[in-house]
């Protein structure tokens, strides 16, 4: 094939090589950019900046090499449009620094920076950490800082991400209240800070105030939905990013729902309880306190991380006729109490009950102070019992 006379020539099925001396001063309008997986650039002294717009449309790019060129600056967001980038070789350029943000969000298997006049500062603490942790092939490069010695020997005691303290109200917060949060940011070289409020939705009206180093946030007219929702303060400096999340507990009274008993491998009387603080629960059977045992007990489902409501079952392992009756769930917290009742009929007497025998009880009197996986089975017979439809 005839030699390619252009600044950039195809290389393989999805590669591009740009090696003609001084032919490029930016990466705009590269031919076939949208399908490129590999881009090799060499001897481009006029290519001094790499910015967000330069790599727009290179969404498939996996390997980027810019070597022996004049690159002095790579923007923190330069690789925003190349999320699949896994190998980045920027050796033998004029880079003095490279922001931690530049590589954030990428899964780089290889990062080559040798041959650059790096300037040791806290802004390269992230790279020093890569070297310490053996990431991206960095240790093998034995990176040097221009006139300062090895990167590995750079003092880093003062190179920390910002320190955040979020102040939340001590007092109880009620539905309808306004809540003021304050985020105090400390640290060197603070660049940006803010709040992440994506979980809040309709939980409150939000008003931001202030700026570095003290950010204010007012949550007005809060609802009970604010419970378990993260309010996050973040801050960045040249070393990295810090985040602190807090939750505001909004008090509200206990509520409870009971549903019709359902038969699974065992029987379940489904319930839902809500309230902040979390309510204490107590079951009554036919009006008397039910003592929980391995045959009848409260079983909670895994709670959702972002809500206060708890779902569960009063689980009954192979109940009999003595368990037929009225079940009441009492829920109480300092802001109120609630109850719900349901009748459950599990089966008729399977033991040929003699009317002259005393009727057994399976509950404790109200003033009692008692604290309180089935085997894999082959069924020998059709179980007794009546099916109860889910309500």
């Amino acid at each position: 094939a005839a030699p390619c006379p252009d600044a950039c020539c195809p290389h393989g099925s999805s590669g591009l090589r740009c090696t003609r001396d001084g032919a490029l001063d930016s990466l705009h309008h590269l031919p076939g950019a949208e399908n490129l997986t590999e881009l090799y650039i060499e001897n481009q002294q006029h290519l001094q900046h790499l910015e967000l717009r330069d790599l727009r449309g290179l969404g498939e790019l996996r390997n980027l090499t810019i070597v022996k060129s004049g690159l002095r600056f790579v923007a923190p967001d330069a690789f925003h449009f190349t999320p699949r980038l896994s190998r980045l070789n920027l050796s033998f350029n004029a880079l003095e620094s490279l922001s931690w943000k530049t590589v954030q969000g990428l899964s780089l298997q290889e990062l080559v920076l040798s041959g650059n006049p790096l300037h040791c500062s806290c802004a390269l603490r992230w790279l020093q950490r890569w070297e310490e942790e053996g990431l991206g092939g960095v240790p093998e490069q034995k990176l040097q800082c221009h006139g300062q010695g090895p990167l590995a020997h750079m003092p880093n005691a003062s190179c920390g991400v910002p320190t955040l303290k979020v102040q939340v109200p001590n007092a109880s917060v009620d539905v309808g209240d306004d809540v003021l949060l304050r985020c105090q940011v400390e640290g060197r070289g603070l660049e940006q800070a803010g709040w992440i409020l994506t979980e809040l939705e309709q939980s409150a009206t939000v008003m931001k105030s202030g700026g570095l180093p003290s950010l204010g946030l007012t949550l007005a007219n809060v609802t009970s939905d604010l419970n378990r929702k993260n309010v996050t303060c973040w801050a960045e400096n040249d070393v990295g990013r810090a985040e602190v999340s807090v939750q505001v507990n909004v008090s509200f009274p206990a509520s409870v729902q009971l549903h019709t008993a359902v038969e699974m491998h065992h029987w379940c009387i489904p319930f839902s309880v809500d309230g902040q603080p979390a309510p204490s629960l107590r079951w009554l059977f036919n009006g008397s306190v039910l003592n929980e045992t391995s045959f009848i007990f409260t079983e909670f489902l895994e709670p959702a991380a972002n809500e206060t409501v708890r779902h569960g079952c009063l689980r009954l392992n192979q109940p009999t006729h003595v368990n037929n009756g009225n079940y009441t769930l009492l829920a109480a917290n300092p802001f109120g109490q609630a109850s719900a009742s349901i009748m459950a009929a599990f089966m008729d007497n399977p033991f040929e009950f003699n009317p002259e025998d005393p009727i057994p009880v399976s509950f404790s009197p109200v003033d009692t102070n008692s604290t309180s996986g089935d085997p894999v089975e082959k069924k020998d017979e059709t179980p007794f019992g009546v099916s109860v439809a889910v309500g």
Epitope: S294, F297, Q318, V322, F351, P375
Partner: antibody, heavy 115, light 108 residues
Framework: EVQLQESGPGLVKPSGTLSLTCAVS?????????WTWVRQPPGKGLEWIGE???????NYNPSLKSRVTISVDKSKNQFSLKLSSVTAADTAVYYC????????WGQGTLVTVSS | SSELTQDPAVSVALGQTVRITCQGG??????ASWYQQKPGQAPVLVIY???NRPSGIPDRFSGSSSGNTASLTITGAQAEDEADYYC???????????FGGGTKLTVL
């Protein structure tokens, strides 16, 4: 499959406290099961001591209630038995098991009360 | 009463059917479970609840209940079935568990 393993001293002095631990493996102690202790004096039958749920609920044999404490340690996936003021009548093989059906048992550990 | 009563000993000819019984007031209200125990070993669950058999237990073992009596039936007893058998159930309050005194089964 769930396995249970009792451990603790095989000899306890009269009036002392018997302490045993049951380690649960092959399953979580925080599952929807209760955990129980049963004992069997030499040449005699089985006696239920008590049961516990990972949320702290517990029930004890009324004849032993004043002397028994059963506790659970979720972080170690184990539960324990303490029996105070022991006498020679408390000499037995002590078993831990999964309640309510006692479908998995430990191999048992003999505890002798003697001076 | 919160007691379960079993016959101390029962024998059966090899291959024949044997019934081991357990009596107690609480059995009018609650199911019995049955355990087999061989010398020097921990008990093994053979029947629980409404006549359920755990995985691995031969189908010659079955359970039933009538009035205040629960029964474990072995249909076609084998030599390896020779063991002590214990019943258990909830007591009449439903809050505690109780065991029967055990039945020693001999297979002749």
């Amino acid at each position: 499959e769930v396995q249970l393993q009792e451990s603790g001293p095989g000899l306890v002095k009269p009036s002392g406290t018997l302490s045993l631990t049951c380690a649960v493996s092959g399953g979580s102690i925080s599952s929807s099961n209760w955990w129980t202790w049963v004992r069997q004096p030499p040449g005699k039958g089985l006696e239920w001591i008590g049961e516990i749920y990972h949320r702290g609920n517990r029930n004890y044999n009324p004849s032993l209630k004043s002397r028994v404490t059963i506790s659970v340690d979720k972080s170690k996936n184990q539960f324990s038995l303490k029996l105070s003021s022991v006498t020679a009548a408390d000499t037995a093989v002590y078993y831990c098991a999964r309640a309510p059906w006692f479908d998995y048992w430990g191999q048992g550990t003999l505890v002798t009360v003697s001076s | 009463s919160s007691e379960l009563t079993q016959d101390p000993a029962v024998s059966v000819a090899l291959g024949q059917t044997v019934r081991i019984t357990c009596q107690g007031g609480s059995l009018r209200s609650y199911y019995a479970s049955w355990y087999q125990q061989k010398p020097g070993q921990a008990p093994v669950l053979v029947i629980y609840g409404k006549g359920n058999r755990p995985s691995g237990i031969p189908d010659r073992f079955s359970g039933s209940s009538s009035g205040n009596t629960a029964s474990l039936t072995i249909t076609g007893a084998q030599a390896e079935d020779e063991a002590d058998y214990y019943c258990n159930s909830q007591d009449s309050s439903g809050n505690h568990l109780i065991f029967g005194g055990g039945t020693k089964l001999t297979v002749l």
